[in-house]
């Protein structure tokens, strides 16, 4: 061989929403006279080299990864070795290597970043009645089934960040999606609005919730 096969993948991670299909792009430049009988294509998990999908001996050997992968057979001869991953799960996140062997061999790794949007936060107060200025209340902001872990920000009605007395916990469910609960302890003024922002750092998606206290009684803004 005069030089090893050049395998090209995107530099940036592929972002896929949970439950959707993702395409992990990979290409190589076939030489004139190239035939699929010469191609050995292996997709594998980068970390372990565990087989995901392969094309060898002139045919698609199928998925070795929960039967959720497919190649683009009509495009292989043109050097398109991309992999389709169906019904993406949190557990799929990570690096995949595209290994191409013709007369020589080469590989490149592409990262899959999984994401799921967070739900609109629900707000609860404790205590939630007979509130007076000077009372200490606990405001809880809860948002569900997002990925990856959220960033949570609190602010008052004037947009001033509230960073003290905030406790945030995030718990993953069996699918790996996170439920976030953030608790703000605050001493009430005469009136005020307290807002919570739950940000998905990958999707750059913000979910907002707020509660307004105007003397008595309290009001919650209507759901959007």
């Amino acid at each position: 061989p005069t030089g090893a096969v050049e395998v090209q993948v995107p530099e940036d991670p592929v972002v896929a929403l949970v439950g959707t299909d993702a395409t992990l792009r990979c290409s190589f430049s076939p030489e004139p006279g190239f035939s699929l009988a010469q191609l050995n294509l292996i997709w594998q998990l980068t970390d372990t080299k565990q087989l995901v999908h392969s094309f060898t001996e002139g045919r698609d050997q199928g998925s070795a990864y929960a039967n959720r992968t497919a190649l683009f057979p009509d495009l292989l001869a043109q050097g398109n070795a991309s992999l389709r991953l169906q019904r993406v799960r949190v557990a799929d996140e990570g690096s995949f290597t595209c290994f191409v062997s013709i007369r020589d061999f080469g590989s490149a790794a592409v990262s899959l970043q999984v994401a799921a949007p967070y739900s609109k936060p629900s707000m609860t107060l404790e205590p939630n009645k007979d509130l007076r200025p000077g009372d200490t209340v606990t405001i809880t902001c809860s948002s569900y089934r997002g990925y990856p872990e959220a960033e949570v920000f609190w602010q008052d009605g004037q947009g001033v960040p509230l960073t003290g007395n905030v406790t945030t916990s995030q718990m993953a469910n069996e699918q790996g999606l996170f439920d976030v609960h953030s608790v703000l302890r605050v001493v009430l003024g005469a009136n005020g609005t307290y807002s919570c922002l739950v940000r998905n750092p990958v999707l750059q998606q913000d979910a907002h919730g707020s509660v307004t206290i105007t003397g008595q009684p309290m009001t919650f803004p209507p759901e959007a």
Partner: antibody, heavy 124, light 109 residues
């Protein structure tokens, strides 16, 4: 347990060629690449090239391009490395080492098994 | 050409902990470089200790561990034994070729 067993020491004249063999005993070449690595006296390790016998494909380090030929015989689980136009600075110990292409066990051990080495001396 | 940098030599004491590193001229080392660590003792063939960044080869004692630290491949030996005195080479995969570092001579005093 797989072992890589290499051919014996060679003394060669400058300008000649040497062919070193590496036989896998106790296992096959399946799912593996066989790499050739050399070490000149007092120097570090240097990768020369590798072959994937099951895929009939191979790569060479640019430095050795045109001077090294790596082949394999799957039927005997033996890989070969031939170096031509020998010079005195090719005097070295030549090693073969296997590396997983696909980790059937789900664990990538890398270049876990090495041959015992073949000393090649180039001298007039 | 890709250059790889290892500490030329390190000295440690029996029972101590030592970390050897491997830096690449191309930038941060990642899992797709499949960092390997190879041990070589005088008069012996090299022995593969770690593959795939952090996978111990069969027979490698648990005191050897591989990782990525600050963009470099690293080999940590915890509870160093006298028999660990050797030269340690890292090797990184770059798409279609292996590149070896210059080696670190580990001395046990």
């Amino acid at each position: 347990q797989v072992q890589l067993v290499q051919s014996g020491a060679e003394v060669k004249k400058p300008g000649s060629s040497v062919k070193v063999s590496c036989k896998a005993s106790g296992g096959t070449f399946s799912n593996y690449a066989i790499n050739w690595v050399r070490q000149a006296p007092g120097q570090g390790l240097e990768w020369m090239g590798g072959i994937i016998p099951g895929f009939y494909s191979l790569n060479y380090a640019q430095k050795f391009q045109g001077r090294v030929t790596i082949t394999a015989d799957e039927s005997t689980s033996t890989a070969y490395m031939e170096l031509s136009s020998l010079r005195s600075d090719d005097t070295a110990v030549y090693y073969c080492a296997r590396d997983q292409v696909v980790a059937t066990s789900g664990v990538n051990f890398g270049m876990d098994v090495w041959g015992q080495g073949t000393t090649v001396t180039v001298s007039s | 050409d890709i250059q790889m940098t290892q500490e030329p030599s390190l000295t440690t004491s029996p029972g101590g902990t030592v970390t050897l590193t491997c830096r690449s001229s191309t930038g941060a080392v990642t899992t797709s470089n499949y960092a390997n660590w190879v041990q070589e003792k005088p008069g012996q063939a090299p022995r593969g200790l770690i593959g795939g960044t952090n996978k111990r080869a069969p027979g490698t004692p648990a005191r050897f561990s591989g990782s990525l630290i600050g963009g470099k491949a690293a080999l940590t030996i915890t509870g160093v034994q006298p028999e660990d005195e050797a030269i340690y080479f890292c090797a990184l995969w770059y798409s279609n070729l292996w590149v070896f570092g210059g080696g670190t001579k580990l001395e046990i005093k």
